[in-house]
Interface confidence: low
């Protein structure tokens, strides 16, 4: 029996310190 696989869409925002502590830029999270 196949399991339904969840699809995670990335959410991208301009953010400071979100993806890297010293970087401002687009940061994408699923």
């Amino acid at each position: 029996r196949r399991r339904r696989r969840d699809t995670h869409f990335p959410i991208c925002i301009f953010c400071c310190g979100c993806c890297h502590r010293s970087k401002c830029g687009m940061c994408c999270k699923t």
Epitope: H20, R21, S22, K23, C24
Partner: antibody, heavy 122, light 107 residues
């Protein structure tokens, strides 16, 4: 051009405090973090801590966190490092450096100040 | 805290020779987070290599970096007179740490 200019050399007595400034120019100050690094005479480099210019978040080296405070003034594009309860072994050259990032790469400390010599002596 | 050990402490070579500097980490470091610096006497350090192998702006191509995991290497393919100075590796993991440095001196 991109540069960091630090305040002048200091002579302090044990137990006193010192505050070193680091003025940035040639780039958008709030888009980068600043690390502080020191170097005792004849010794290697010691990372002291970091501050995010855009939000004031800090990360201090464990051995210094009780005595150090890092701040920024975004209106003048200046970072500050204050070290309290000075001891003779705090005698060193103190550097500020810009922390660079590019995508998923830590691009190193890519711009450095000229250094500020702090001498602690009675 | 990740400890970086550089070897040898001092490297004695002649101009034109190849220098191989080693940096070993006490635990695995992402290659993306490993950098090398050069420091001349009385000057601030200068960034040479970031991301273990990417040359910083203005760095001559005689400098190259490699490695992954816990073992990283800086190679200077042909030593010029101005290369006889001190080199440091640095990692950024949970916090920043530097290696103890390698001094490259004229034999």
């Amino acid at each position: 051009q991109v540069q960091l200019v630090q305040s002048g050399d200091e002579v302090k007595k044990p137990g006193a405090s010192v505050k070193v400034s680091c003025k940035a120019s040639g780039y958008t100050f709030i888009k980068y973090g600043i690390s502080w690094v020191r170097q005792a005479p004849g010794q290697g480099l010691e990372w002291m801590g970091w501050i995010g210019a855009f939000n004031g978040n800090t990360d201090y080296a464990r051995n210094l966190q009780a005595r150090v405070t890092m701040t920024t003034d975004t209106s003048t594009s200046t970072a500050y490092m204050e070290l309290r309860s000075l001891r003779s072994d705090d005698t060193a050259v103190y550097y500020c450096a810009r922390e660079g990032w590019n995508d998923d790469y830590f691009c190193g400390l890519d711009v450095w100040g000229q250094g500020t010599t702090v001498t602690v002596s009675s | 805290e990740i400890v970086l050990t550089q070897s040898p402490g001092t490297l004695s070579l002649s101009p034109g020779e190849r220098a191989t500097l080693s940096c070993r980490a006490s635990q695995s470091v992402s290659s993306n987070y490993l950098a090398w610096y050069q420091q001349k006497p009385g000057q601030a350090p200068r960034l040479l290599i970031y991301g273990a192998s990417s040359r910083a702006t203005g760095i001559p191509d005689r400098f190259s970096g490699s490695g992954s995991g816990t073992d990283f290497t800086l190679i200077i393919s042909r030593l010029e007179p101005e290369d006889f100075v001190v080199y440091y590796c640095q990692q950024y993991g949970s916090s920043l740490t530097f290696g103890g440095g390698t001094k490259v001196e004229i034999k």
